[in-house]
């Protein structure tokens, strides 16, 4: 299920061109669209422009990250007089134009969402031919991708003084809370966010000292679900085995 929060819309003025009454450049995008990882989401974008009945060459572009300079994730071009905007770029084949640019609609569908898609997107239209003009959404639409926790790594590592420590790394949005359980453990360790990896969706918790043999379980939970993974510590002849 996809939620769209219409908050503010962009209505930014650009060059006015001979038409009466004057229709200005503007772009309407929602402040945020929210969807779950693995699902699809629609990023709405409509625009107005001052060039009445423009029928020349047209290019529709979507960028990610930042306006004007961010990497393109989608681009299509329509020839003069054509309503068919033929796709020239669709990153990983997951971006589809739902709106017809000739009808002032650049709405985009993003398929098979991943947490890495959680960023801001900016629509842009370019006119060529007799008229040379272009306009880009300045504030863009934030795509908020949610996901249940997934433990992506759990491991036992050598620690100081022949001891062992355990690390558990998970991803999810909202960021999951992590807890360790195991032999002679109380409430487990506190989770600390990782250093900026994975667009802030990674959370790592360390168990600094594994003092007893046995099974240690890392539990990750957020409002969308929970996940567990375990490692086993068996000390013999100064070595460890973990699974």
């Amino acid at each position: 299920f996809v939620r769209t929060k219409i908050d503010t819309t962009e209505n930014l003025l650009n060059t006015e061109v001979h038409s009466s009454p004057v229709q200005r450049w503007s772009m309407q995008v929602p402040a945020e669209v929210s969807a779950a990882a693995g699902d699809a989401a629609v990023l709405p974008c409509t625009f107005t422009h001052p060039h009445r009945h423009y029928d020349g060459p047209l290019t529709a572009i979507w960028r990610a990250g930042e306006p004007y300079a961010g990497p393109q994730v989608f681009r299509c071009a329509a020839a003069r007089g054509s309503e068919l905007c033929q796709t020239a770029l669709s990153l990983h084949g997951r971006f589809r134009l739902l709106g017809n640019p000739r009808r002032n609609d650049l709405s985009l569908r993003v398929e098979r969402l991943a947490l890495a898609d959680d960023r801001r997107y900016f629509c842009r239209v370019e006119f060529a031919g007799d008229v040379h003009d272009r306009y880009e959404s300045r504030h863009g639409v934030r795509l908020h991708v949610t996901a249940a926790p997934r433990i992506i790594n759990i491991s036992v590592l050598p620690g100081p003084a022949h001891a062992f420590r355990a690390l558990c790394t998970t991803e999810g949005e909202p960021p999951p809370a992590l807890a360790w359980s195991g032999p002679a453990l109380g409430n487990g360790s506190a989770a600390v966010p990782s250093s900026g990896q994975g667009h802030g969706h990674l959370v790592t918790a360390e168990l600094p000292a594994l003092n007893h043999d046995g099974r240690y379980t890392c539990t990750a939970a957020n409002s969308l679900g929970r996940s567990e993974a375990s490692v086993y510590l068996f000390r013999f002849h100064g070595a460890s085995a973990s699974t």
């Epitope: 299920f1 996809v2 969807a35 699902d39 699809a40 989401a41 629609v42 299509c76 020839a79 054509s82 309503e83 068919l84 905007c85 033929q86 796709t87 589809r96 134009l97 739902l98 709106g99 017809n100 569908r109 398929e111």
Partner: antibody
Framework: QVQLVQSGGGVVQPGRSLRLSCAAS????????MHWVRQAPGKGLEWVAV????????YYADSVKGRFTISRDNSKNTLYLQMNSLRAEDTAVYYC?????????????WGQGTLVTVSS | QSVLTQPPSVSVAPGKTARITCGGN??????VHWYQQKPGQAPVLVIY???DRPSGIPERFSGSNSGNTATLTISRVEAGDEADYYC???????????FGGGTKLTVL
């Protein structure tokens, strides 16, 4: 996996009404335009109607305009076709289909079809 | 409104190449999609956007589109390819979808 399960077909008298349903699963229903396509016995495929992903735009074939209404309930992941003033020539297998591409796109998944017979 | 013309039938021997055409005014400027339909079954997309193949469709199926004719080509035809084939486009003036009349492919 994507599934479109249809229901609501049957035998109906001319001039009466019938509502077809298409329950979608395995994909984000609210992000896709949906269509109805029909096929009269022994004939070819005929496009009937389309509804945009959010229900804001609807288009109909001339042969059904004013009699058929396409709608959707995104909260229930269900597509509908309300058929009024039915005629003998509306007898066909009706398919719901998902539009998989861009706005000029194709039908990448189809329902199993449901037979509507208009007869007195 | 677009009108798409297909031959009613095409016959081909196993192992040979079948070509099914779809004629329409300046169809080369449109995006053409092809469907296969076997008796009693729903249609299946075999080619989209002129020449792209959905996953699961054998490489033996290919498409082309230029001028006033789009073509579906099936190489090394097998008995299981026997079916009805339909071309389809988007009519930009009406936002309607238009199907060709269909072609029955018979494998001799």
């Amino acid at each position: 996996q994507v599934q479109l399960v249809q229901s609501g077909g049957g035998v109906v008298q001319p001039g009466r009404s019938l509502r077809l349903s298409c329950a979608a699963s395995g994909f984000t229903f609210s992000s896709y335009a949906m269509h109805w396509v029909r096929q009269a016995p022994g004939k070819g495929l005929e496009w009937v109607a389309v509804i945009s992903y959010d229900g804001s735009n609807k288009y109909y074939a001339d042969s059904v305009k004013g009699r058929f209404t396409i709608s959707r309930d995104n909260s229930k992941n269900t597509l509908y076709l309300q058929m009024n003033s039915l005629r003998a020539e509306d007898t066909a297998v009706y398919y719901c289909a998902r539009e998989g591409g861009s706005y000029y796109g194709y039908f990448d998944y189809w329902g199993q079809g449901t037979l509507v017979t208009v007869s007195s | 409104q677009s009108v798409l013309t297909q031959p009613p039938s095409v016959s081909v021997a196993p192992g040979k190449t079948a070509r099914i055409t779809c004629g329409g005014n300046n169809i080369g400027s449109k995006s053409v999609h092809w469907y296969q339909q076997k008796p009693g079954q729903a249609p299946v997309l075999v080619i989209y956007d002129d020449s792209d193949r959905p996953s699961g469709i054998p490489e033996r199926f290919s498409g082309s589109n230029s001028g006033n004719t789009a073509t579906l080509t099936i190489s090394r035809v097998e008995a299981g390819d026997e079916a009805d084939y339909y071309c389809q486009v988007w009519d930009s003036s009406s936002d309607h979808r238009v199907f060709g009349g269909g072609t029955k492919l018979t494998v001799l």
